[in-house]
């Protein structure tokens, strides 16, 4: 199995969750740091990230298949300040591995709604504050 990283988003009321998911082998978890950057085209690193998560080996997980680890960054209420380009990344200095997810964007519209574009799973997500639903 190949190590990879994916980005996704979910809405809970007015909250927007940005999710970075890393798929990896159980034994490769240790040493990995997953992080989310905003408006960092070339220098996305744990030090410049909005949030980071250090993975640890979980001895309770049986088998040697692929497992997933998630970092979740929650925006309680999206404002124009949250507009920008985001990227999920992961790094393991222990293994010399760098993973860079696709860029995705949050665009705050004049109507008070916002759209999330560029996510691989769903190409275009549109969120409405008023309705609190995915449209």
């Amino acid at each position: 199995g190949c190590i990879n990283i994916t980005s996704s988003a979910s809405q809970e009321g007015t909250r927007l969750n940005l999710i970075c998911t890393v798929w990896h082998k159980k034994e490769e978890a240790e040493g990995f740091v997953v992080f989310l950057c905003k408006d960092r085209s070339g220098d996305c690193s744990p030090e410049t990230s909005l949030k980071q998560l250090r993975l640890k080996r979980d001895p309770g997980i049986d088998g040697v298949g692929e497992i997933s680890s998630q970092l979740m960054f929650t925006i309680s209420q999206v404002t124009p300040l949250h507009s920008g380009t985001y990227q999920c990344c992961a790094r393991s200095q222990k293994s010399g591995i760098r993973l860079q997810g696709h860029f995705f964007s949050i665009l705050f519209t004049e109507t008070g709604n916002y759209t999330v574009t560029g996510l691989k799973q769903r190409q275009h997500l549109e969120f409405s504050h008023n309705e609190g639903t995915l449209s």
Partner: antibody, heavy 112, light 107 residues
Framework: QVNLQESGPGLVQPSETLSLTCTVS????????VYWVRQPPGKGLEWMGR???????DYNPALKSRLSISRDTSKSQVFLKLNSLQTEDTAIYFC??????WGQGTLVTVSS | DIQMTQSPASLSASLGETVSIECLAS??????LAWYQQKPGKSPQLLIY???SLQDGVPSRFSGSGSGTQYSLKINSLESEDVATYFC?????????FGGGTKLELK
């Protein structure tokens, strides 16, 4: 089984360029990074630089002006070039898969 | 660069004894510390990563601890095969740096 093997000249003249090759097996260079570390005889370890799985490189600032690391993924080889050699560059040169698996090292002597 | 000060530089101990090796970082390295064992003429072998995580195949008599700037490697019930030089490594900050090494000998 993960294996790394360093190869290159045992003796290099001062002011010349050192070229070393690290040939790997048991893993893909697009999945794991390779680091270079050196050790002067009887002394400590110095990290020189690395090439990540995605092909990006980092260098020790103390060596950056003289060092370059590249790779040929199809041949499973990583290359180190260190120019303007001085006698202080005499060392055992190791390549490693990240921090976990190391080659046995190759001794390079810089002398005229 | 972060300086890693390792102590002692050399250590003599008897079989069955417990020994400790210390590494002091010049600034907080947030547990991003590894310990290596190197035998003469051989390449370093990773013992411990992230301050306290024992690597696969490493005997349980080896253990690592510490946080912030202070870290230690402990070898319980010393065996003859443990005679080697031990190095610490920080990879918290670029560039990664090693301690100067501790040579462990038998009394």
């Amino acid at each position: 089984q993960v294996n790394l093997q360093e190869s290159g000249p045992g003796l290099v003249q001062p002011s010349e360029t050192l070229s070393l090759t690290c040939t790997v097996s048991g893993f893909s260079l697009t999945s794991y990074g390779v680091y270079w570390v050196r050790q002067p005889p009887g002394k400590g370890l110095e990290w020189m630089g690395r090439i990540w799985n995605d092909g990006g490189t980092d260098y020790n600032p103390a060596l950056k002006s003289r060092l370059s690391i590249s790779r040929d993924t199809s041949k499973s080889q990583v290359f180190l070039k260190l120019n303007s050699l001085q006698t202080e560059d005499t060392a055992i040169y190791f390549c490693a898969r990240g921090w976990t698996h190391w080659g046995q090292g190759t001794l390079v002597t810089v002398s005229s | 660069d972060i300086q890693m000060t390792q102590s002692p530089a050399s250590l003599s101990a008897s079989l069955g004894e417990t020994v400790s090796i210390e590494c002091l970082a010049s600034e907080d390295i947030y547990n991003n510390l590894a310990w290596y064992q190197q035998k003469p003429g051989k390449s370093p072998q990773l013992l411990i990563y992230y301050a306290s995580s024992l690597q696969d195949g490493v005997p349980s008599r080896f253990s690592g601890s510490g946080s912030g700037t202070q870290y230690s490697l402990k070898i319980n019930s010393l065996e003859s095969e443990d005679v080697a030089t031990y190095f610490c490594l920080q990879d918290s900050e670029y560039p990664p740096t090693f301690g100067g090494g501790t040579k462990l000998e038998l009394k």
